[in-house]
């Protein structure tokens, strides 16, 4: 009597995550009578994958009808494969009994699963930093297999070199994750800049996956301040302007102080953008010189994006302007502001 053979023709099978895998198994003889079972792994810790007689195996189906008389094909199909399904699968013949006795195992078929990396997610610093400071961006992608992957960082199309990348876990696993940190030196021109994290993997059809972050979320460009006096008007009023230039973001509060006393407070809003993404703002104050005996110290105080206030002062020389007789009206503080 010829010895029963359990034939698993493929040593290895590779499938893409989400696809179905067919694991082939045939037996050389109908005798002895007894069931076939499929296991993943060998030894005492092996996992039952399919048993025709009992159990609920929603993703596993028999390729042929195993209840048919003279059936010798016990191949199975596993649907919706995930990286967690990777492993070596054994087709095992049992002799019918109470309990059934394991008779012979196939040589095993190694199932390898290729899985695409998830879309890279780029996150920037929690708080804004000013130009000439270095900030870190992090890029993460998960769930890919095999482990080999390349990750590159770009700022405005130029590859970044100050990068640290880790693929986890270090050892063998069903799937892997990558995490990379890039350090980026900010400049005042970076409001419109973008960093891109680019991930390439064998499963991607030639096009790397990209994650992006805008440096506008990470940068603060502090304003330049300039206070100037316009020429004296015929009505004895001096126009003093405070030019606040090249700042980002727009969140800005400007306060005029006359001799240390608050004269007017304004909030920037709906400013047009400069080409580089920054903003400018000009505010002015009309000072009635005839209302003052002494020189007037005007201060333009700017609080930008919650940072400590920046001041720029200017003295209006009252002695340089002729006083109106009997005039004792308060300084004008109803100036208008112009938004550039």
């Amino acid at each position: 009597e010829e010895e029963l053979q359990v034939i698993q023709p493929e040593k290895s099978v590779s499938v893409a995550a989400g696809d179905s895998a067919t694991l082939n198994c045939t037996v050389s003889s109908l005798i002895p009578v007894g069931p076939i079972q499929w296991f993943r792994g060998a030894g005492p810790g092996r996992e039952l994958i399919y048993n025709l007689k009992e159990g609920h195996f929603p993703r596993v189906t028999a390729v042929s009808d195993p209840t048919k008389r003279n059936n010798m094909d016990f191949s199975i199909r596993i649907s919706n494969i995930t990286p967690a399904d990777a492993g070596t699968y054994y087709c095992v013949k049992f002799r019918k009994g109470s309990p059934d006795v394991e008779l012979k195992s196939g040589a095993g078929t190694e199932l390898s699963v290729r899985a695409k990396p998830s879309a890279p997610v780029v996150s920037g610093p929690a708080v804004r930093a000013t130009a000439e400071h270095t900030v870190s961006f992090t890029c993460e992608s998960h769930g890919f297999s095999p482990r080999d992957i390349t990750l590159k960082w770009f700022k405005n199309g130029n590859e970044l070199s100050d990068v640290q990348t880790n693929v986890d876990p270090a050892g063998k696993s069903v799937s892997y994750s990558i995490r990379s940190t890039a350090r980026v030196l900010l400049t005042r021109r970076d409001v419109h800049s973008q960093v891109i994290c680019e991930v390439a993997h064998v499963t991607l059809q030639g096009d790397p996956l990209r994650g992006t972050a805008n440096l506008s979320e990470a940068i603060r460009v502090p304003p330049f301040l300039e206070v100037t006096q316009q020429s004296m008007r015929a009505d004895n009023q001096v126009n003093v302007t405070c030019q606040v230039t090249k700042f980002y973001p727009q969140r800005l509060q400007l306060t005029w102080l006359e001799n240390g006393n608050v004269s007017r407070t304004e909030m920037a809003s709906a400013l047009p953008e400069n080409k580089d993404g920054t903003y400018n703002w000009t505010s002015w104050l009309l000072v009635n010189v005839s209302a003052h005996r002494d020189d007037v110290k005007l201060t333009c105080q700017v609080e930008h994006d919650g940072q400590p206030a920046v001041n720029k002062s200017f003295s209006v020389k009252v002695s340089a302007h002729p006083k109106e007789q009997g005039s004792n009206t308060a300084a004008e503080n109803t100036g208008t502001n112009e938004r550039n």
Partner: antibody, heavy 116, light 109 residues
Framework: VQLVESGGRLGQPGTSLTLSCTVS????????MGWFRQAPGKGLEYIGI?????SPYYASWVNGRFTISKTSTTMDLKMNSPTTEDTATYFC?????????????WGPGTLVTVSS | DIQMTQSPSSLSASVGDRVTITCRAS??????LAWYQQKPGKAPKLLIY???FLYSGVPSRFSGSGSGTDFTLTISSLQPEDFATYYC???????????FGQGTKVEIK
């Protein structure tokens, strides 16, 4: 699933020539496609690929001698200024469904002869 | 660029023989290696991908092994239709470029 190359002919050195690879049974927007060549009696040589989105990538030796592009059903290889050394059979091929590391479907090839 | 060195460049064998062809990469390509069979005037045909996975429809007498830099294609029992030229092809996941070995011609002894 089928690939068929066309455009191979006898050409003059320096006169540009365009080869086409017409595909059927699948979408060019889903797979990387490649161009390869084989000089008479020699081995296979990789020229370049075009990604599913249409980005071309070339072998380091190409240096602008070839341009790969595609439409919805054809992939083209333009030989910009061919020399006699470009005489070969040119093959187009499609990468496998599991990844870009191998090519499972090939066209029969088209012969280009560059001669004065 | 990665170089692929295939050996031997040619061999003579008889039907039923076990044939082994090797391919060595100049640097590690992990398991990104494919084997093709080509007959005169025809396009290459994929036999093995990922170093050891048999492509569908390819007879089980063909097998591949190896990883890193050293790879082997084995034909366990040579058949008349197996007389052809065999090429290895690498893919490098960092440069994302392909390189072929120079080919091995299997002839009838």
């Amino acid at each position: 699933v089928q690939l068929v190359e066309s455009g191979g002919r006898l050409g003059q050195p320096g006169t540009s020539l365009t080869l086409s690879c017409t595909v059927s049974g699948f979408s060019l927007s889903s797979y990387v496609m490649g161009w390869f060549r084989q000089a008479p009696g020699k081995g296979l040589e990789y020229i370049g690929i075009i990604s599913s989105s249409g980005s071309p990538y070339y072998a380091s030796w190409v240096n602008g001698r070839f341009t790969i592009s595609k439409t919805s059903t054809t992939m083209d290889l333009k030989m910009n200024s061919p020399t006699t050394e470009d005489t070969a059979t040119y093959f187009c091929a499609r990468v496998g469904p599991l990844g870009v590391d191998y090519f499972n479907i090939w066209g029969p090839g088209t012969l280009v002869t560059v001669s004065s | 660029d990665i170089q692929m060195t295939q050996s031997p460049s040619s061999l003579s064998a008889s039907v039923g023989d076990r044939v082994t062809i090797t391919c060595r990469a100049s640097q590690s390509i992990n398991s990104y290696l494919a084997w093709y069979q080509q007959k005169p005037g025809k396009a290459p045909k994929l036999l093995i991908y990922s170093a050891s996975f048999l492509y569908s429809g390819v007879p089980s007498r063909f097998s591949g092994s190896g990883s890193g830099t050293d790879f082997t294609l084995t034909i366990s029992s040579l058949q008349p239709e197996d007389f052809a030229t065999y090429y290895c092809q690498s893919w490098h996941y960092i440069s994302r470029s392909y390189t072929f070995g120079q080919g091995t011609k299997v002839e009838i002894k």
